[in-house]
């Protein structure tokens, strides 16, 4: 008889999760020479140890501490790119601008990007049927706690001028409840971060409004300024042209505004 298993509202662990994490780790360490010392089996053991046999609504940041230590990486000053609700463009940008890094360009972010995982209390099994949903079940679930933990650490270690890409098509361009708004903003270290520069990405081709004047951007400016970090904002009216100009900065059309 199959064991009774708790039904959660969210989708279950991504199929072949252990194999995927291990394969991603091996690939990452092959491509990034500075991470060649990383033992991917230990990384998987630490990842697994954070959620296996644990009640999936009672996960803590401490559970991920071994993984965070094993996956330690530093980003050079001025090279951190945060993003909120505009992941694809942020990743397209760092794929072209190879010296800038989002969290998903770092080992731990790369391992977990787009994956779901959870276990069950007192068994060594991975739950492939369902996992807790952040809204409907609980916030202290393995996936949410992981991203909160690594996002906090990513922001804590940033230095110089930090950039953030924001989605200008959303009703709340800056959302206090996003990972950026609730975790990263509050963990930038004023003694190391001189400024936060927001890039507001416009959606419509004919949209010429100055979205840097949006009330939510002003709210972000206020939060950042109160933390003794300078704030700058730029409109990116043409994201397609923006990416093209990152690829080919000498292009004559790139001398005009983007």
């Amino acid at each position: 008889l199959p064991r009774w298993r708790q039904q959660w509202s969210g989708s279950g662990t991504t199929s072949r999760f252990p194999e995927t994490v291990l394969a991603r780790c091996v690939k990452y360490t092959e491509v990034h020479p500075e991470m060649r010392h990383v033992d991917c089996q230990s990384v998987w053991d630490a990842f697994k140890g954070a959620f296996i046999s644990k009640y999936p609504c009672n996960i803590t940041e401490e559970d991920y501490q071994p993984l965070v230590k094993l996956g330690t990486q530093t980003v050079p000053c001025n090279k951190t790119l945060l993003w909120s609700r505009i992941k694809d463009l942020a990743h397209q940008f760092t794929q072209v601008q190879r010296d800038m890094f989002t969290l998903e360009d770092m080992l731990l972010g790369y391992l977990a990007d787009d994956l779901t995982w959870c276990g069950e209390f007192n068994t060594f099994e991975i739950n492939y049927q369902s996992c807790p949903d952040w809204r409907k079940d609980c916030s202290n679930n393995p996936v949410s706690v992981f991203w909160k933990t690594v996002s906090r650490r990513f922001a804590e270690t940033a230095c110089g001028v930090v950039h953030v890409m924001l989605n200008g098509s959303r009703s709340k361009i800056f959302d206090k409840n996003s990972t950026f708004g609730s975790v990263e903003v509050h963990n930038l270290q004023p003694e190391k971060v001189q400024a936060l520069e927001a890039w507001v990405i416009h959606g419509g081709r004919e949209d010429s409004r100055d979205l840097c004047q949006d009330p939510t951007i002003k709210e972000l400016e206020s939060i950042i300024s109160k933390r003794n970090i300078r704030f700058f904002c730029k409109n990116i009216y043409r994201p397609d042209k923006f990416l093209q100009c990152v690829k080919n900065p000498e292009d004559s059309s790139c001398l005009s505004g983007i």
Partner: antibody, heavy 118, light 107 residues
């Protein structure tokens, strides 16, 4: 090969401060945590805390907060630990350990003996 | 903080004996336990990491086992150079903590 070279023994007066250094060689200093460990004469090992030189991020054992302060100079590949308001309880050998970002301590410095005495 | 209870605190054995040192963690530390050897007047040296992995250059007579909260270090065929104090250490969570040590003497 990986080496951690610590500064020499120190004799200091109660209430004073001391700064111990740990110079790393044989690896990329900024990328790896440096751990600090205390050993009092005839007693066991105590973890004080650690620092990631590349970012300056630190973790301290609650017991040593206010007592130990970690810094690092990436230009000279040197980590420092300052101990303040010294008492006889602080008389000990202090070790730095590091390399690998592991959850264990692979390479150790030779230790720095700090003696607090009037 | 996670407490590491190591036993025995001292141990006397004969050359060629097999000895076992145990370490008990106050909470689950998965496999994040390492063992160190410290000879008199020397620095600690890593013997075993991740509960059972032998560090480079360490003789195969040393072995480690366990996971969760219970761990053991075994030295088979005791040699004179094994006279030392042995410590366990957990790396599961900050602050990292060590066992109190086991002083090994030869009869």
């Amino acid at each position: 090969q990986v080496q951690l070279q610590q500064s020499g023994a120190e004799l200091v007066k109660p209430g004073a401060s001391v700064k111990i250094s740990c110079k790393a060689s044989g690896y990329t200093f900024s990328n790896y945590w440096i751990e600090w460990v205390k050993q009092r004469p005839g007693l066991g090992l105590e973890w004080i805390g650690d620092i990631l030189p590349g970012s300056g991020t630190t973790n301290y054992n609650e017991k040593f907060k206010g007592k130990a302060t970690f810094t690092a100079d990436t230009s000279s590949n040197t980590a420092y630990m300052q101990l303040s308001s010294l008492t006889s309880e602080d008389s000990a050998v202090y070790y730095c350990a590091g390399y690998g970002n592991y959850l264990w301590f692979t390479y150790w410095g030779q230790g720095t003996l700090v003696t607090v005495s009037a | 903080d996670i407490q590491m209870n190591q036993s025995p605190s001292s141990l006397s054995a004969s050359l060629g004996d097999t000895i076992t040192i145990t370490c008990h963690a106050s909470q689950n530390i998965n496999v994040w336990l390492s063992w160190y050897q410290q000879k008199p007047g020397n620095i600690p040296k890593l013997l075993i990491y991740k509960a059972s992995n032998l560090h480079t250059g360490v003789p195969s007579r040393f072995s480690g086992s366990g996971s969760g909260t219970g761990f053991t270090l075994t030295i088979s065929s005791l040699q004179p150079e094994d006279i030392a104090t042995y410590y366990c250490q957990q790396g599961q969570s900050y602050p990292y903590t060590f066992g109190g040590g086991t002083k090994l003497e030869i009869k």
